[in-house]
């Protein structure tokens, strides 16, 4: 049998190398960059995905006002350190020994420091606000239809339980999706809101992480919903610690 015939691939993560060398000749997949085994029946953690991405060849009014403590990922891509479970390590450092603390979605939450910087714990991001602007349409989408479709998307495509989709707000053309998941709410096996948000972000950008599964086909009552810009805000269980210099910049 060829690999194509056996279809030994990871449907949930195209950034993997798979081979039928698992127990009983079963397909086993490892993330690029880290070489860690991944569970292809669910989403791969954002940390492993970022690490794989960095290792890959380079190519090409009802609306919510984010809190003063909301973080936006302004630092962009970096090659993260992941723990054995695939989560971000609380302290991240670059090759020049510059270090910083991150939250559970890998976004910097302190000023940058040196190797003496301590990050005592990985602080959980418990609230994610996804702010979207959709392309012009003939008319506004029906709010309840839009709400149902986005909840369905997070349940069916990203396997995120609907209870973690706290709200969907809409004021044409702005859509806001609120994801909430406290440490106490997240059971073993539940998809993490940070991972679901990252898969969604990549889908919206036309960079789907799914293997072989088509790109995002988002429709509301048959009408395509096309997103032209995305902003994601992250709120941590413990507010971030930045110096006043940054806050006034």
């Amino acid at each position: 049998h060829t690999a194509a015939q056996d279809n030994c691939t990871c449907p949930t993560n195209k950034m993997t190398v798979c081979s039928p060398d698992g127990p009983g000749g079963r397909c086993q997949c490892r993330a690029l960059g880290s070489g860690m085994a991944v569970d292809c029946s669910t989403l791969t953690s954002k940390c492993l995905l970022l690490k794989a991405r960095m290792s890959a060849p380079k190519n090409a009014r009802t609306l919510v006002r984010p809190s003063e403590h909301a973080l936006v990922d302004n630092d962009g891509l970096y090659d993260p350190d992941c723990d054995p479970e695939g989560r971000f390590k609380a302290r991240q450092c670059n090759q020049t020994s510059v270090c910083w603390c991150v939250n559970s979605v890998g976004v910097r939450r302190t000023d940058k420091g040196d190797l003496s910087l301590r990050c005592d714990e990985l602080v959980r991001t418990h609230h994610i606000l996804i702010d979207l602007r959709h392309r012009p349409t003939a008319g506004a989408f029906n709010h309840s239809d839009l709400d149902a479709e986005l909840r369905r998307l997070f349940r069916e495509r990203y396997r995120l339980h609907p209870k973690f989709v706290a709200a969907v707000h809409y004021e044409q053309p702005t859509i806001q999706i609120e994801l909430r998941q406290n440490t106490s709410q997240k059971a073993a096996g539940d998809v993490d809101i940070g991972d679901a948000a990252y898969y969604f972000e990549r889908d919206i950008k036309g960079e789907s992480l799914f293997q072989g599964r088509g790109g995002l086909d988002l429709r509301v009552r048959g009408e395509p919903l096309q997103v032209e810009r995305t902003l994601i805000y992250y709120l941590d269980e413990i507010p971030p610690k930045f110096s006043m210099k940054r806050l006034t910049a």
Epitope: R152, E156, A187, A188, R213, D217, R219
Partner: antibody, heavy 116, light 108 residues
Framework: QVQLQESGPGLVKPSGTLSLTCAVS?????????WSWVRQPPGKGLEWIGE???????DYFPSLKSRVTISVDKSKNQFSLKLSSVTAADTAVYYC?????????WGQGTLVTVSS | DIVLTQSPGTLSLSPGERATLSCRAS???????LAWYQQKPGQAPRLLIS???SRATGIPDRFSGSGSGTDFTLTISRLEPEDFAVYYC?????????FGQGTKVEIK
């Protein structure tokens, strides 16, 4: 490799309650998947009955909702189906399945006959 | 609820031929939420395709899926003897999953 195994009585009396259990092995029921029941009357097509998440959240097919209860027992890694007030029309092969971008793992099915 | 209608009801073909099975939805279904199954007599169904076009693990590449909106297609490029079975489409784009009534692919 995830495996599912249905068990329960093969014969139920009319107006009685059909009770089946699905044991999950090779994987945890406390995963991001939903767990479904599907049935197939003799010589007919597939009918979805309903499904459950490990926290006990459920979805049921509307026409069966008033008669169906699906429950989960995480300690035993199993989930169960109860269908009340059964008639001959409920005679079918009953399957349990994992719902993960389609039903990717199925039990072998168990035939339940409703007859006095 | 979304009703799925499969056609034809029966397809009579010879091994080596191409099989084209159709599934039409009563209302638009995102292609992310359509699956195809194969069922042989006395066996449980087997997932072939999810997300309208993504082959499930272990499914040979002669099986392919396509379509969007209300029209979806399962194609078997060259029928092998083991492919003669009943095929079902299924949508999971609403909280209530529904199946088509099935297409039987039989030996001519």
């Amino acid at each position: 490799q995830v495996q599912l195994q249905e068990s329960g009585p093969g014969l139920v009396k009319p107006s009685g309650t059909l009770s089946l259990t699905c044991a999950v092995s090779g994987g945890s029921i406390s995963s991001s998947n939903w767990w479904s029941w599907v049935r197939q009357p003799p010589g007919k097509g597939l009918e979805w009955i309903g499904e459950i998440y490990h926290d006990g959240s459920t979805d049921y097919f509307p026409s069966l909702k008033s008669r169906v209860t699906i429950s989960v027992d995480k300690s035993k890694n199993q989930f169960s189906l109860k269908l009340s007030s059964v008639t001959a029309a409920d005679t079918a092969v009953y399957y349990c399945a994992r719902d993960n971008w389609g039903f990717d793992y199925w039990g072998q099915g168990t035939l339940v006959t409703v007859s006095s | 609820d979304i009703v799925l209608t499969q056609s034809p009801g029966t397809l009579s073909l010879s091994p080596g031929e191409r099989a084209t099975l159709s599934c039409r939805a009563s209302q638009s279904v995102s292609s992310s939420y359509l699956a195809w199954y194969q069922q042989k007599p006395g066996q449980a169904p087997r997932l072939l395709i999810s997300g309208a076009s993504s082959r499930a693990t272990g499914i040979p590449d002669r099986f392919s899926g396509s379509g969007s909106g209300t029209d979806f297609t399962l194609t078997i490029s060259r029928l092998e003897p083991e492919d003669f079975a009943v095929y079902y489409c299924q949508q999971y784009g609403s909280s209530h999953r529904t199946f088509g009534q099935g297409t039987k692919v039989e030996i001519k």
